[in-house]
Interface confidence: low
């Protein structure tokens, strides 16, 4: 019996031994994608579906509220600035927008998990694309912030201040454009699909196995590994420079950005490790069995929930780590509550150091 994963990939003896019981190591080949036959049957999803039904709607609802409030507050604070936004603030504003748009899709996914997808194929494509656009945008914008800091501090190059203010906007547009490109498969392949086994309709991909694996690899690399590597590289160099210059104030100013990067890593690493296991199963490097698949499905639900938590985490980090954000937020609340008290509308200082709540004239983070 010939055991092949696809026309291009033949299993080796070790993999054949592991998969001897099955016709194929993976069960999701499209009719035109691979000429292999016949597949292992889809696994029963009772446990993972029941888990999702109980766990996801509650989590998504909570994240929706927290994310909307938190990121709304960040956007409000940034947009209430009288002066032009600094490069980092602009990136943070875009990050808040990305996080807000992502959490806006969560109620739809909560309904999908609790009951079924009742919103049709059009909204399935839009919600899926919106979700992924903002997943990628969040990671890439954090990488942009770290690269901006790196240029400013390590190379003393104020890329976005020397050139026209439009440069940071162009960078953000490039990020959004790239994310839109990454989300093309969502627009093309996502649809509301009726699952006969579950007797329910769900918003899911309908494309060949190789495409699914490629998309997961893209998500892993472009949405996690690359941004994380950029962040790690940039901040390692920044910290080295600051330690050498013994800039205690500047080191203190780096607190927020280090915490934001650590939060990104902590929130998304578990999910991407699970995705990696899934990729390995897709490729046949790990034998696929129903027990493992069920555990991976549940792990994916839990770790993706942790990942989406990151959308709500940034505002909280700003609030608890960033002194200036608290000041600005407090002032904004007072201004909204007491519109007649003109004294409260006054900016604390017109100096460049206070013109932003994330940057200082020394091109590092302020005390926040």
């Amino acid at each position: 019996m010939v055991l092949e994963v696809s026309d291009h990939q033949v299993l080796n003896d070790a993999e054949v031994a592991a998969l001897l019981e099955n016709f194929s190591s993976s069960y999701d080949y499209g009719e035109n994608e691979s000429d292999s036959c016949c597949t292992s049957p889809p696994c029963p999803q009772d446990f993972s579906l029941n888990f999702d039904r109980a766990f996801l709607p509650a989590l998504y609802s909570l994240l929706f509220l927290l994310g909307l409030l938190g990121n709304g507050a960040v956007a409000a604070v940034l947009l209430s600035r009288r002066t032009a936004l600094s490069s980092t603030d602009t990136f943070l504003l875009h990050l808040a927008v990305a996080d807000t748009l992502l959490v806006l899709t969560l109620p739809l996914w909560a309904v999908d998990a609790a009951v079924q997808w009742v919103f049709g194929s059009g909204l399935c494509k839009v919600a899926g694309a919106l979700f992924n656009i903002n997943f990628y945008a969040g990671a890439l914008l954090l990488a942009c912030i770290s690269f901006d800091r790196y240029l400013n501090i390590v190379h003393a190059t104020q890329l976005y201040r020397r050139g026209p203010p439009a440069r940071v906007t162009l960078t953000c547009l490039a990020v959004w454009g790239l994310c839109l490109l990454f989300a093309l498969p969502d627009f093309i392949f996502l649809s509301a699909h009726h699952d006969e086994r579950l007797n329910a309709t769900h918003c899911q991909y309908n494309f060949p196995q190789v495409g699914r694996t490629a998309l997961r690899v893209l998500q892993l690399v472009a949405g996690f590994l690359l941004p994380l590597l950029v962040m790690a590289y940039c901040y390692a160099h920044i910290l080295a420079v600051l330690l050498v210059s013994r800039g205690q104030r500047r080191l203190r100013a780096m607190r927020l950005v280090v915490v934001v990067v650590v939060a990104f890593a902590l929130c998304w690493t578990p999910y991407h490790l699970v995705v990696l296991v899934d990729i390995l199963m897709d490729l046949g490097a790990l034998a696929r069995n129903c027990g493992r698949e069920s555990r991976v499905d549940v792990a994916k639900s839990v770790t993706s929930g942790l990942g989406y938590m990151h959308c709500c985490l940034n505002p909280l980090l700003y609030a608890f780590v960033g002194v200036k954000f608290r000041e600005r937020m407090w002032m904004l609340l007072l201004r909204l509550g007491c519109p007649n008290q003109r004294g409260l509308q006054r900016q604390p200082s017109s100096s460049r150091r206070d013109s932003s709540w994330s940057e200082t004239s020394e091109a590092s983070y302020s005390g926040l």
Partner: antibody, heavy 123, light 106 residues
Framework: EVQLLESGGGLVQPGGSLRLSCAAS????????MSWVRQAPGKGLEWVAT????????YYPDSVKGRFTISRDNAKNTLYLQMNSLRAEDTAVYYC????????????????WGQGTLVTVSS | DIQLTQSPSFLSASVGDRVTITCRAS?????LYWYQQKPGKAPKLWIY???TLASGVPSRFSGSGSGNEYTLTISSLQPEDFATYYC?????????FGQGTKLEIK
Amino acid sequence: EVQLLESGGGLVQPGGSLRLSCAASGFTFTSYAMSWVRQAPGKGLEWVATISHGGKYTYYPDSVKGRFTISRDNAKNTLYLQMNSLRAEDTAVYYCARHPIYSGNYQGYFDYWGQGTLVTVSS
Amino acid sequence: DIQLTQSPSFLSASVGDRVTITCRASSGVNYLYWYQQKPGKAPKLWIYFTSTLASGVPSRFSGSGSGNEYTLTISSLQPEDFATYYCQQFTSSPYTFGQGTKLEIK
């Protein structure tokens, strides 16, 4: 309407050969994996061979491996089973059957069957 | 190979009876598939993915089970239900069928 029509059955001596054909109509033959399943008189069903939709991959149980060869001609919408070194225990009604596609995946059960052709191996 | 054992092999029942056919697997299977066959005819897909009725199958039929034990139940037997029923697995190669359960009129 999906139709599968087997032919080529008959009486053959032990050690002899026979080639069965299955003419398919009513569906896009090139998109489906196909199989042969047999049923000895008064007995249960036994899977004999499977071929992928493009004809590149074939699968057999140990009982017929090396003796039977499944093939297809997608241009003619026809499935074949070449049976060599026939034994008395190969006597059965041979059905050709279609594998369904579920969510883009080939499934190992059979959604349509032909009426069968009887193969008798006897001296 | 996974062996499928159906019980009973023969079953005599009357119209209106509730009938249950069991299929036991020698090792766990993910799903089970059921076929109906009438004398001189080709088998017909009856139930797939353990519990999904094939097109045209009356709702009095139901399938259930998991792991090693699966059942096909007919809530109220009708004259056209008298036939032989086979279970099948394709969790592992080779595809195997049960020996069949012949349902006869009492």
